[in-house]
Amino acid sequence: MKVLQEPTCVSDYMSISTCEWKMNGPTNCSTELRLLYQLVFLLSEAHTCIPENNGGAGCVCHLLMDDVVSADNYTLDLWAGQQLLWKGSFKPSEHVKPRAPGNLTVHTNVSDTLLLTWSNPYPPDNYLYNHLTYAVNIWSENDPADFRIYNVTYLEPSLRIAASTLKSGISYRARVRAWAQCYNTTWSEWSPSTKWHNSYREPFEQH
């Protein structure tokens, strides 16, 4: 039994890091493998993660961690029974993938303005809480070409757009994702999408 693709890990900079790897053949990850991880720290305790299958030869492990700080560094040991298959390390602050925003809502009752709001996925005491920026994706269910991205570079989790920038009388969907420049993170996953029917009064045209 050998590791074909070494574990790569990303952290949500809160309580979970996710490591993925591939074995050289079909593997029952949960019964055959264990990923041990330990904070490089005096007297720190070792933890064991039981991996799950992720495709035939792929494995994934969700490592539970205390709130992450930038100095944290973990040793990782991948075991198959008594055999050490791979040894490595992981610094969560250097491999951050933020949590996805939630509770995306489209408020259509403001006159001819669409107000999109969502929730910051972090509690106020987490470092990322005040460092997230967002991308909002809006698309038409009827027209695949009607697809747009709005970059929200301010901290408030909301976006206002004129309803007239979208076509009237058709349904749209929106979703939002986050990233943090401070840690040069990857983008989060997209939030679940939300749907609304866009309608507004066309301005009266005089001829």
Partner: antibody
């Protein structure tokens, strides 16, 4: 809820001995390193000894050879055997859950060394 | 051994003030821990691994720093924050504490 309760302190003459205990609950005791810390009457905090989850032990130089830290994982109890006591060992002794995760302290047990 | 020097030794602050307590290490450490102690009570873990708040600690507290320079900050002082604060290094044995900073209410 993590709980640490120290006991075993008391008044002892110089050169005497005591065995301090710390009863732990609310977490998997065997998985964590544990430590003893003391606070002198002048309110100075001083680390005394630690024991890892794998039973490795570490001591403050001034207590080496006189104090022994140990643990009973079956009963969830941390011990500190203190002997050849000196007046400078007079302090409130606290047990602590150590390691990288959130630390917890007990309420302490008082050791007074006096003739 | 690593010596921790806290400053100031004593300070007073009015309600609403921002308060910063410093802890300087004689050599570089990866993390700093902070404890709060009120008269007649045992020390309480307050901040661990530099910036994580212990359970029940109000969000007005924060910790920061790296290398040899660390600090505890209270964004807006409240009466209940009057106490003595100790820093501790967990970098190498022997584990050592600062002498404490006594924070009084003005």
């Amino acid at each position: 809820e993590v709980k640490l309760v120290e006991s075993g302190g008391g008044l002892v003459k110089p050169g005497g001995s005591l065995k301090l205990s710390c009863a732990a609950s609310g977490f998997t005791f065997s998985s964590y390193a544990m430590s003893w810390v003391r606070q002198t009457p002048e309110k100075r905090l001083e680390w005394v000894a630690s024991i890892s989850s794998g039973d490795s032990t570490y001591y403050l130089d001034s207590v080496k050879g006189r104090f022994t830290i140990s643990r009973d994982n079956a009963r969830n109890i941390l011990y500190l055997q203190v002997s050849s006591l000196r007046s400078e060992d007079t302090a409130m002794y606290y047990c602590e859950r150590s390691g990288g995760s959130a630390p917890y302290w007990g309420q302490g047990t008082l050791v007074t060394v006096s003739a | 051994q690593i010596v921790l020097t806290q400053s100031p030794a004593i300070m007073s602050a009015s309600p609403g003030d921002m308060v910063t307590i410093s802890c300087s290490a004689s050599s570089s450490v990866n993390y700093m821990y902070w404890y709060q102690q009120k008269p007649g009570s045992s020390p309480k873990p307050w901040i661990y691994r530099t910036s994580n708040l212990a359970s029940g600690v109000p969000a007005r507290f924060s910790g920061s720093g790296s290398g040899t320079s660390y600090s505890l900050t209270i964004s807006s002082m409240e009466a209940e924050d009057a106490a003595t604060y100790y820093c501790q290094q967990y970098h190498s044995f022997p584990l050592t504490f600062g002498a404490g900073t006594k924070l009084e209410l003005k």
